[in-house]
Interface confidence: medium
């Protein structure tokens, strides 16, 4: 025997008490599948949440976060955006560890400080969690006759002579 409630479409509920009539969902509620005996209450996007998609009789509201906050999980929580000197992890905003930095507001990851000694440069200014180190000039920059503004020669494609 077919369940008469299976004929109730999404956006309605099957009212047991009224000979299984398909009644429309009450205000601020929805049913996304047919045959439901009650309607789910709509999610309300309040406070730091803002409405990304309005609730309809057949689908729930969807929220995102107000500027300065970001979603966690399926946007079940809004967390303050990370400041410079932090990065977003599964556990939330974490301060960059020693030797790394993030200079971006709200986004980005902690990146290692530049290693000045790799190209023989000295450290002019120590790095922080928010700023990279400032390296001194390279030895080549300091050699006589060197010009730091000489443009590189343009590359030529083989087999082509200049016009």
């Amino acid at each position: 025997l077919q369940d008469p409630c299976s004929n109730c479409p999404a956006g309605t509920f099957c009212d047991n008490n009224r000979n299984q009539i398909c009644s429309p969902c009450p205000p601020n509620s929805f049913s996304s599948a047919g045959g439901q005996r009650t309607c789910d209450i709509c999610r309300q996007c309040k406070g730091v949440f803002r409405t990304r998609k309005e609730c309809s009789s057949t689908s729930n509201a969807e929220c995102d976060c107000t500027p300065g906050f970001h979603c966690l999980g399926q946007c079940t929580r809004c967390e303050k955006d990370c400041r410079p000197g932090q990065e977003l992890t599964k556990q939330g905003c974490k301060t960059c560890s020693l030797g790394t930095f993030n200079d971006q507001n709200g986004t980005g990851v902690c990146r290692p400080w530049t290693n000045c000694s790799l190209d023989g440069r000295s450290v002019l200014k120590t790095g922080t969690t928010e700023k990279d180190v400032v390296c001194g000039p390279s030895p080549a920059d300091l050699s006589p006759g060197a010009s730091s503004v000489t443009p590189p020669a343009p590359a030529r494609e083989p087999g082509h002579s200049p016009q």
């Epitope: 409630c5 509920f13 009212d15 008490n17 009644s23 439901q36 009650t38 789910d40 209450i41 999610r43």
Partner: antibody
């Protein structure tokens, strides 16, 4: 015939987490909601929270930080977890089916929970 | 949260009496009100939903009325099996809240 049956530990120590299960027979959790209600000794009924057919939840704002309601549709079970228990959580805990325009048409018999060391 | 206040908290009446129980909401709840009966053994049953709609199987001596903030449950002729505590419950706004209950006894 629709039946709801609560099962719980009976006695729980303060600061521990309470875990109660509501087993539903003769009714589908994908069509109906389930609401948890408790009643301290000699006092009135207090709504704790609801899980909807779609799986979303709403909680009593005063208890929200301590409550988790979840369900397993295939087992027809709804579970209530409440953390950081105190003596004030000693009560009879009921689950009830939510239907129609949000009335509780079938109730479980209740399970007694005592919080004591 | 919406506060629900019931009066009286207890009452004693004779068999066959007409009994009325009042329920007041701290703000307007339209007709979004249900009534429940809790027997001395703890069993809870739905009596009336949406202010005045009788749940299936509930005797016709029970009736409900009201709108907005003030509601009434009436038992037209008290029977021995009506000894119980009666609760109103609003579902206008989450969290859904119950009244404090009215304990009904037989004189």
């Amino acid at each position: 015939q629709v039946q709801l049956q609560e099962s719980g530990p009976g006695l729980v120590k303060p600061s521990e987490t309470l875990s109660i299960t509501c087993t539903v027979s003769g009714s589908s959790l994908t069509s109906y909601g389930v609401h948890w209600v408790r009643q301290p000794p000699g006092k009135g009924l207090e709504g704790l929270g609801v899980i909807w057919p779609g799986g979303s939840t709403n909680y009593n704002s005063a208890l929200m930080s301590r409550l988790t309601i979840s369900k397993d549709n295939s087992k027809s079970q709804v579970s209530l977890k409440m953390s950081s228990l105190t003596a004030a959580d000693t009560a009879m805990y009921y689950c009830a089916r939510v239907t129609g325009t949000w009335y509780f048409d079938v109730w479980g018999q209740g399970t007694t929970v005592t919080v004591s060391s | 949260d919406i506060q629900m206040t019931q009066s009286p908290s207890s009452l004693s009446a004779s068999l066959g009496d007409r009994v009325t129980i009042s329920c007041s909401a701290s703000q307007g709840i339209s007709n979004y009100l249900n009534w429940y009966q809790q027997k001395p053994d703890g069993t809870v049953k739905l009596l009336i939903y949406y202010t005045s709609t009788l749940h299936s199987g509930v005797p016709s001596r029970f009736s409900g009325s009201g709108s907005g903030t003030d509601f009434t449950l009436t038992i037209s002729s008290l029977q021995p099996e009506d000894v119980a505590t009666y609760y109103c419950q609003q579902y206008s706004k989450l969290p859904w809240t119950f009244g404090g209950g009215t304990k009904l006894e037989i004189k």
